[in-house]
Interface confidence: low
């Protein structure tokens, strides 16, 4: 008799990452009988929702349902119908919504309300939409990359070696850059974490981890650019801002009302004698770098050592995975190779920023001008943040690995979030509260 293929006994989970600039839906899949094994969950689909981040829908909440339709329908196609009802759906909103909540808790709530109602209309097991904390975002990103790199596994592997994996079980640090915030998370070497807010303790697969994490709100690449513009326009004598972070020949008109719309620019806000100003690019990496450094207050530190703005940062330890916008920007600039030294990256950035805007547009004709125009700033910002903000050096630069995917799954907080909420990381209950959510509202 012929052997019939048994139906696949698998489970699925969906996580929506509602970021400041866009929303992405991730579908994960794992063998039902191996739920507690490490490394068995993998991503089968990513769907990028067309349009901006959900925080931009405050004035048009009625459009949220349509906005989410395509990707939710895609999930309906990818996941077998028989599995729909038992597939959990989680939506986590990050710094864009944290900023909106700072402006108005009511507005943030209204957006989440409509998101929840929209997602409840699908046949899945909707588990709630919430604004995750910066601490959670950092922690879940750290869990994701170490889970995918096999760092929590004590087994000898018979399958192909995971990229970046060494034989030791030392965890990787996680560097995450978004549009509105950036997170740094790692296990320091025998170092007391001097500020309790930055300390996480949890037990994963029978091992204890003391983890440092911090999320810098307003220091994602988009909000950092708004901050820089708000700072620089203060000293501009008229409504022309000659900006070294944009290519020579680049011009763009900015509304002052848009500049001051975000809470991130409040500290620079002043009454200006004009409603609009024009950015005129001059393309100078060194000057751009200097301007960015002014966003980091390094003169005050109440601890033994700090990153910036008085935030404790222990000495860097081990290898780091840099993902999300760290990866996307450096990938565009062709600087993700392990062989490219920090000095070489700086040299390449100098050349790139100095290229005339017309030349850049011709060379990258397929790229949207809005994104294309900001790569000089973003690349320079990444260097400034890593070197002066987090204190990486030319030597320790080689410990930064720019990672997009690991084993086919995107590096980011979503997988760690789902692993935690579906109780798929066996261990005693984590001691730290941010990673335990018993109820969703």
């Amino acid at each position: 008799t012929q052997n019939k293929a048994l139906p696949e006994n698998v489970k699925y989970g969906i996580v929506l990452d509602a970021g400041s600039s866009h929303t992405s839906l991730y579908i994960y899949k794992w063998p039902a009988e191996k739920e507690n094994d490490t490394g068995v969950v993998h991503q089968v689909e990513e769907c990028r929702v067309k349009g901006p981040g959900i925080s931009k829908f405050v004035q048009k909440v009625n459009e949220i349902g349509i906005y989410l339709t395509d990707c939710m329908e895609r999930a309906r196609e990818v996941i077998p119908r028989s599995q729909h009802q038992e597939t959990p759906v989680y939506l986590g909103a990050t710094a864009g919504m944290r900023l909106l909540r700072m402006e108005s808790e009511e507005l943030a709530d209204r957006v989440l309300d409509v998101v929840e109602r929209s997602l409840s209309n699908y046949p899945f097991d909707f588990q709630g939409a919430r604004i995750i904390t910066g601490q959670e975002e950092g922690a879940y990103g750290w869990i994701t990359i170490n889970y995918l790199l096999g760092k929590f596994s004590q087994k000898t592997r018979w399958f192909s070696i995971v990229p970046y994996e060494t034989n030791n079980q030392e965890t990787f640090g996680a560097l995450d850059l978004g549009g509105a915030s950036t997170q740094v998370t790692f296990v320091p070497q025998n170092q007391t974490i001097e500020s309790p807010d930055n300390a996480l303790q949890f037990r994963l697969y029978g091992k204890d981890y003391n983890v440092y994490t911090h999320s810098f709100l307003c220091y994602g690449k988009d909000q950092a650019l708004w901050q820089k513009l708000a700072k620089d326009i203060q000293v501009a004598s008229n409504e022309i801002l000659r900006d070294p972070c944009f290519h020579p020949g680049y011009k763009k008109v900015v509304n002052v009302s848009d500049l001051y719309k975000t809470p991130c620019t409040k500290r620079f806000e002043m009454t200006l004698p004009f409603q609009q100003f024009e950015i005129q690019g001059i393309g100078n990496y060194q000057q751009c770098h200097q301007s960015i450094l002014e966003l980091f207050n390094t003169s005050y530190c109440p601890y033994s050592q700090c990153a910036f703005n008085g935030i404790f940062l222990p000495p860097l330890q081990g290898d780091f995975g840099a993902f999300s916008a760290f990866y996307f920007v450096m990938k565009f600039l062709n600087l993700t190779s392990e062989k490219v030294s920090q000095e070489k990256v700086t040299e390449m950035m100098k050349k790139f920023c100095a290229q005339p805007w017309e030349e850049i547009k011709t060379s990258y004709a397929g790229v949207k001008e809005k994104y294309l125009s900001e790569y000089c700033f973003s690349g320079t910002y990444i260097l400034s943040l890593l070197l002066q903000g987090y204190h990486f050096t030319a030597d320790s630069w080689e410990h930064i690995h720019f990672i997009g995917k690991i084993q086919g799954s995107d590096a980011g907080w979503t997988l760690g979030y789902m692993l935690n909420l579906t109780n798929m990381i066996p261990a005693e209950q984590p001691l730290s509260t941010p990673l335990s959510h018993s109820t969703y509202v």
Partner: antibody, heavy 116, light 111 residues
Amino acid sequence: EVQLQQSGPELVKPGASVRMSCKASGYTFTDYNMHWVKKNHGKGLEWIGYINPNNGGTTYNQKFKGKATLTVNTSSKTAYMELRSLTSEDSAVYYCTRGGTRFASWGQGTLVTVSA
Amino acid sequence: NIVLTQSPASLAVSLGQRATISCRASESVDNYGISFMYWFQQKPGQPPKLLIYAASTQGSGVPARFSGSGSGTDFSLNIHPMEEDDTAMYFCQQSKEVPFTFGSGTKLEIK
């Protein structure tokens, strides 16, 4: 189900202080601000202020600055309000109410009576 | 501070009839195209209960006979048809800006 359980009634002397509590359950405590509202016979409802349980940041109604102090203990999911230098004007029912989703969840109230 | 003036101070309505309570704000409570006006019902010995949020959206589990309308500075709460259980104090509240403020309340009774 979201629940806010407030501490019992207090009888206090003029000039003294009182500290009341509000224990939250049924939701992630740090996801929502906790607001406090005063209900007295003559003046109806008055908003006192709120605290963000994530970082302990507070925003007060100017009228209650120096009168009320809001604090939280995230591990016990409890919010506290201390009222100082009490006078008969402070005799009222005080409610805690969860921020966001529009004050849909309220505690049962703590009655404070200031009397010599 | 935004002052909310509620009227009438008290109102008696026959069972099955319509009760209308008004609330006027000293300045607009609209922001981003949303009216930050709320209506609460409070019975003796109980905390306030949310009836209407964002001027016209019903709170969870609120009967359809409660409806809200208005924008900018003028708002109203309608109860129709009036039921015995609706005897209570009704308050409007704005949360457009700090300090959040409440109206002085309307006492609704059965005629």
